[in-house]
């Protein structure tokens, strides 16, 4: 079908719809990725919490913003920042923003365009 | 070596029509999106409209909107950009480019450009 | 009236460095990618700068990209006199559905 795209519902909509949802569970998915099931994440107890559920609680909050492409990168903007300042190293951010960005694929939403995930001023 | 060459700019009179064509060559157009971008006399660079690889997702200048229509064959590699209800406001050179824009996590940006044409409307 | 804001003019002698701002707000630099063009006279418009940082083949290393928070920066070093150019910043603004340039700045190499 061929269509011509009207505006996305503007920044502060969606910026209040981030607020609303709660990002954690993906953040601890992603963690849990990177680190590896076996590793614990000592920001948060997620040892009885396997990776898979994570995942699938992350794509039900996500799930309950409005599907556009400018929100879902908010979303994803929201999580590196949130997390920019527990990851290590160089290698540790580039590894979570993979994750990241594989992020709307595995919960089947679309990937967002124009989405720059370098969100934290160059402390990631 | 890629080769965007614009032509059909002409001198028109307000509330005329004209369409603008780019015959791309060099690279495979079907893989890019491709954008309209203008420039006043004298003035900075204004983008017109983006249009996506397959022509599904088209966007445009507020002020061009409903008199703009931005289209491609992919199969002879051309773009067009139909103006109608054209105004003084519209004059300016028009530039076709190569948006290297992909599907996520990356920005419009302009590899690009054509020599540019030149639309004059007035009467 | 540009969305984006540049200087409208800046100038250093040869072989200086300078720097060229561009502003905006979340709705555009915030969230998206700025990439940054010269015009020579009379010509068209060439990319320098894309994604930020990245540099197209064929652009030496003295043209640089930054981005932080809703304001993007080019830097020049080494100026040399056939860099006296307009150079224009751009990036998508999520609000409006549309790329957005900057106005333009006047590089004028002393």
């Known amino acids: 079908m061929r269509r011509e795209r009207g505006r996305q519902g503007d920044s502060s909509s969606c910026e209040r719809q981030v607020d609303r949802v709660n990002l954690k569970p993906c953040e601890q998915h992603i963690m849990q990725r990177i680190m590896g099931e076996q590793e614990q994440y000592d920001s948060y107890d997620i040892r009885s919490t396997r990776s898979s559920d994570q995942q699938q609680r992350c794509c039900d909050e996500l799930n309950e913003m409005e599907n556009t492409q400018r929100c879902m990168c908010e979303a994803l903007q929201q999580i590196m920042e949130n997390q920019c300042d527990r990851l290590q190293d160089r290698q540790m951010v580039q590894q979570f923003k993979r994750e990241l960005m594989n992020l709307p694929q595995q919960c089947n939403f679309r990937a967002p365009q124009r989405c720059d995930l370098d969100v934290s001023g160059g402390r990631c | 070596e890629v080769q965007l060459v614009e032509s059909g700019g002409a001198l028109v009179q307000p509330g005329g029509s004209l369409r603008l064509s780019c015959a791309a060559s060099g690279f495979k157009f079907s893989t890019f999106y491709m954008t309209w971008i203008r420039q006043a006399p004298g003035k900075g660079l204004e983008w017109v409209a983006n249009?996506?690889?397959?022509?599904?997702?088209?966007d445009y200048l507020d002020s061009v909107r409903g008199r703009f229509n931005i289209s491609r064959d992919n199969a002879k590699s051309v773009l067009y950009l139909q103006m109608n209800t054209l105004s003084a406001d519209d004059t300016g050179v028009y530039y076709c480019?190569?948006?290297?824009?992909?599907?996520?996590?990356?920005?419009?940006?302009?590899?690009?450009w054509g020599q540019g044409i030149l639309v004059t409307v007035s009467s | 009236q540009s969305v984006l804001t540049q200087p409208p003019s800046v100038s250093a002698a040869p072989g200086q460095k300078v720097t060229i701002s561009c502003s905006g707000t979340g709705s555009n630099i915030g969230h998206n990618y700025v990439s940054w063009y010269q015009q020579l006279p009379g010509t068209a418009p060439k990319l320098l700068i894309f994604d930020n940082t990245k540099r197209p083949s064929g652009i030496p290393d003295r043209f640089s990209g930054s981005k932080s928070g809703s304001s993007a920066t080019l830097g020049i070093t080494g100026l040399q006199t056939g860099d006296e150019a307009d150079y224009f910043c751009?990036?998508?603004?999520?609000?409006?559905?549309?790329?957005?340039f900057g106005g333009g700045t006047k590089l004028t190499v002393l």
């Open positions: 480019t190569r948006n290297g824009l992909q599907d996520s996590y990356s920005g419009d940006f302009f590899d690009h």
């Open positions: 751009a990036t998508w603004d999520a609000d409006l559905s549309a790329v957005l």
């Open positions: 249009i996506k690889q397959d022509g599904s997702e088209k």
